[in-house]
Interface confidence: medium
Amino acid sequence: LVPHLGDREKRDSVCPQGKYIHPQNNSICCTKCHKGTYLYNDCPGPGQDTDCRECESGSFTASENHLRHCLSCSKCRKEMGQVEISSCTVDRDTVCGCRKNQYRHYWSENLFQCFNCSLCLNGTVHLSCQEKQNTVCTCHAGFFLRENECVSCSNCKKSLECTKLCLPQIENVKGTEDSGTT
């Protein structure tokens, strides 16, 4: 199946790259506006300039365009622990991120929350904390991994998955007790 082109894509495809077809006169190709600007008025005729105006404060366009309005700058979500990495400029949206020793957990495509990287206490760092992934820990002997924290095998109940990891430890304890009674 051939995907249908949208009206705007159809119109643009008639003109060479960097130009768009005049909405009222399809024989005219107008030059697109540079990033950081928006379309105020279409070019009056072939070879004549498109009237582009710079985006106002709080708005931007990040690529060449023929938008009638600039896009509103994103705001970092404080309730998600986000911090501003770089401010919005006329040609670039706000860049949001996390503080040092934190990683992003994406709840949806454009929505992330910042969480502290695990420290791997009672274990070692197997994989360092990344921008979008928590530290991966490996636990020392006598400890097992539960919710990415190293927990003592003394907290391991028979019904839990940790019994496999703590089995040598449990057998050692039993063995010591048995040898003490004979």
């Epitope: 957990h105 949806s108 969480f115 919710e147 990415n148």
Partner: nanobody, 120 residues
Framework: EVQLLESGGGLVQPGGSLRLSCAAS????????MGWVRQAPGKGLEWVSM????????YYADSVKGRFTISRDNSKNTLYLQMNSLRAEDTAVYYC?????????????WGQGTLVTVSS
């Protein structure tokens, strides 16, 4: 077929409690983040709470922080929302939502909703 079935809504007095449940089927529950969204009468959708696939990470809207607790039981394919100290402004239809499939990172499936009415 993905199905999300909410239950536990009802009429409750201010200061009271309710526990919502969401029974999930038709997908591998343990692999997905889940969330609760609500829509008050005449208002837009509001994210209430979200929980990661393993239950470790949670998000709460400021309006419910300290009063609501999200949890999940992956062995039962069920999502929960414990709502305490309920207020009149918590009156809404509460929806259970499943997160994205693959690269289409959006909450792609919603339940039918359960109505919570807080009134004296």
């Amino acid at each position: 077929e993905v199905q999300l079935l909410e239950s536990g809504g009802g009429l409750v007095q201010p200061g009271g409690s309710l526990r919502l449940s969401c029974a999930a089927s038709g997908f591998t529950f343990i692999e997905y983040d889940m969330g609760w969204v609500r829509q008050a009468p005449g208002k837009g959708l509001e994210w209430v709470s979200m929980i990661s696939s393993d239950g470790r990470l949670t998000y709460y809207a400021d309006s419910v922080k300290g009063r609501f607790t999200i949890s999940r039981d992956n062995s039962k394919n069920t999502l929960y929302l414990q709502m305490n100290s309920l207020r009149a402004e918590d009156t809404a239809v509460y929806y259970c939502a499943k997160t994205w499939d693959g690269l289409n990172r959006n909450f792609d499936y919603w339940g039918q909703g359960t109505l919570v009415t807080v009134s004296s």
